[in-house]
């Protein structure tokens, strides 16, 4: 990661993708340390305060404007050299978001995937974006970039992610950029949580008072395991949102969550998954499906199947 013998390494924390009005810390790592450095922008636009200024350890930039977008380099202090400064660092591209209307982000076949599978994340917009960028929350690397394809007044790009492993799980957002302003990005798409299942042993799912109940009777689904899961997720076939609850240790040394469904109106097939707080987007194998049947209610309506949505903050910690 570090630069060559006389080349510093310039990096951004927390990310090279910065919302308009936000702040970012630029660090110039030179010769095993963060020393004094100079910073400059390749296109020389804006940032007059860089000229002739020396920064110590890190430079906090912001509140950022579209004019901050661009390529930066630094030079580390080298007192005994001819110029007093190192060779220029690697180029660091800072992208500023919030400059155009947000695009949409979809997952195909869906956002809940098994380890080893591949998912296509499609970013699209009716704004004629030249490039699309895909960024995963919490990582400081540059986002993936693809050229937008334009068909029928819609620009879109398909990002292939996989084979999926735990490190690829998380919250994704995409952005668009227009020609001539490649680093001035749109507002972010709504977040899309990509969840990887099948990494840990399956929990068991049971119903109280039982899987077959009278209409109007209260039903509770219990998800439990010997594994010390922190959170359980309950999904219903054909329903867009999962429910989640914190796991509670029981006297028999299992970890359990009880999901009250309330008075039964119509049945359905349920599954549950376990996950750990440290990796909220990495789930266990699915429990065996549990079919809950409701009797005495012939007119019950079944919801139409929809693609499971992961826009409810699955990948955030449950506090």
């Amino acid at each position: 990661l570090m630069g060559g013998q006389d080349k510093p390494f310039l990096s951004a924390r927390p990310s090279t993708v910065v919302p308009r009005g936000g702040h970012v810390a630029l660090q110039c790592h030179y010769r095993r340390g963060f020393n004094n450095f100079m910073l400059y922008k390749e296109d020389r636009s804006h940032v007059p305060i860089f000229h002739g200024r020396i920064f110590q350890e890190s430079f906090i930039m912001g509140p950022v404007t579209p004019a901050h977008a661009g390529t930066y380099r630094c030079r580390g202090s080298r007192p005994h050299s001819l110029t007093g400064w190192s060779a220029p660092s690697n180029p660091l591209v800072i992208m500023v978001t919030g400059n155009h209307r947000k695009p949409s982000l979809l997952a195909h076949p869906g956002p809940l995937l098994k380890s080893g599978e591949t998912v296509i994340l499609q970013c699209w917009s009716d704004v004629m974006f030249e490039h699309f960028f895909l960024h995963r929350e919490g990582i400081s690397e540059d986002p993936s970039r693809l050229v937008g394809q334009i068909h029928d007044g819609v620009s879109k790009a398909n990002f292939s992610i996989g084979p999926l492993m735990p490190v690829l799980a998380g919250t994704y957002r995409c952005y668009g950029s227009v020609p001539h302003s490649p680093y001035q990005l749109s507002a972010p798409s709504d977040p899309l949580d990509i969840v990887i299942t099948g990494l840990y042993e399956k929990p068991s799912l049971s119903a109280q008072p039982g899987p077959t109940v009278q209409a109007g009777e209260n039903v509770t689904l219990s998800c439990s395991s010997w594994s010390s899961y922190d959170i359980y997720h309950l999904s219903r076939e054909g329903e867009a949102h999962e429910r989640r609850l914190r796991a509670v240790p029981k006297v028999n040394r299992t970890f359990q969550a009880d999901f009250p469904l309330g008075p039964a109106t119509h049945g359905g097939t349920y599954r549950c998954f376990g996950s750990f707080r440290a990796l909220p987007c990495v789930w266990s194998n699915s429990s065996d499906p549990l079919l809950v049947s409701v009797t005495g209610n012939p007119s019950s309506s079944w919801p139409s199947p929809t693609e499971p949505s992961s826009k409810s903050g699955i990948c955030r910690h449950l506090h």
């Epitope: 702040h23 007059p48 920064f55």
Partner: antibody, heavy 118, light 107 residues
Framework: QIQLVQSGSELKKPGASVKVSCKAS????????MQWVQKTPGKGLEWIGW????????KYAEDFKGRFAFSLDTSASTAYLQISSLKAEDTAVYFC???????????WGQGTSVTVSS | DIVMTQSHKFLSASVGDRVTFTCKAS??????VAWYQQKPGQSPKLLIY???TRHTGVPDRFSGSGSGTDYTLTISSVQAEDVAVYYC?????????FGGGTKLEIK
């Protein structure tokens, strides 16, 4: 939303010390710095200096070097201004404000009144 | 140190008027000028930075312009809630310095 909450008013005797706190919320504390500004009826708004919350490196305006010191508790998202050997002319309202190397102060604390009187 | 001068201590306007605050720097500050509003009993609030960039949530009746040493803040249609002291600040070189402020009063 971004908020900076400062500690309450202080009444001190000359020669004493005071420590003003500024607790930040609503953003990642270490991605920005904390600026400190003094407001007096005579001189208006004066920049005391700032501390880089990412590196912990402070920078002081020439007129405030010596008795003024900045510190951080990043785990509590809190910045501190300590003034030692207080003088009557330190009587002022002290503001913390979020900002970085570019000197723009985008969110301000409510201010802490420090009165130095014997 | 760069001195920022706001020549008017007071400005008076009626609701709906257009009002302009001026600020002069003792040297070229290369558009690195911010404007703050301080209402009675409150802390300053950022309105404009880099001469003309409006801060989040600031109404578009506030605008800034200028270059070199001369900068202005304009309120296109003054509202009663705009009663405050307005400060300019240069963020070109440390120490950052503020103007003495201009108090806006409503007639």
């Amino acid at each position: 939303q971004i908020q900076l909450v400062q500690s309450g008013s202080e009444l001190k005797k000359p020669g004493a010390s005071v420590k003003v706190s500024c607790k930040a919320s609503g953003y990642t504390f270490t991605t920005a710095g904390m600026q400190w500004v003094q407001k007096t009826p005579g001189k208006g708004l004066e920049w005391i200096g700032w501390i880089n919350s990412h590196s912990g490196v402070p920078k002081y305006a020439e007129d405030f070097k010596g008795r003024f010191a900045f510190s951080l508790d990043t785990s509590a998202s809190t910045a501190y201004l300590q003034i030692s050997s207080l003088k009557a002319e330190d009587t002022a309202v002290y503001f913390c404000a979020r900002g970085g190397d570019e000197g723009v102060m985008d969110y301000w604390g409510q201010g802490t009144s420090v009165t130095v009187s014997s | 140190d760069i001195v920022m001068t706001q020549s008017h201590k007071f400005l008076s306007a009626s609701v709906g008027d257009r009002v302009t605050f001026t600020c002069k720097a003792s040297q070229d500050v290369s558009t690195a000028v911010a404007w703050y509003q301080q209402k009675p009993g409150q802390s300053p609030k950022l309105l404009i930075y880099w001469t003309s960039t409006r801060h989040t949530g600031v109404p578009d009746r506030f605008s800034g312009s200028g270059s070199g040493t001369d900068y202005t803040l304009t309120i296109s249609s003054v509202q009663a809630e705009d009663v405050a002291v307005y400060y300019c600040q240069q963020h070109y070189s440390t120490p950052w310095t503020f103007g003495g402020g201009t108090k806006l009063e409503i007639k």
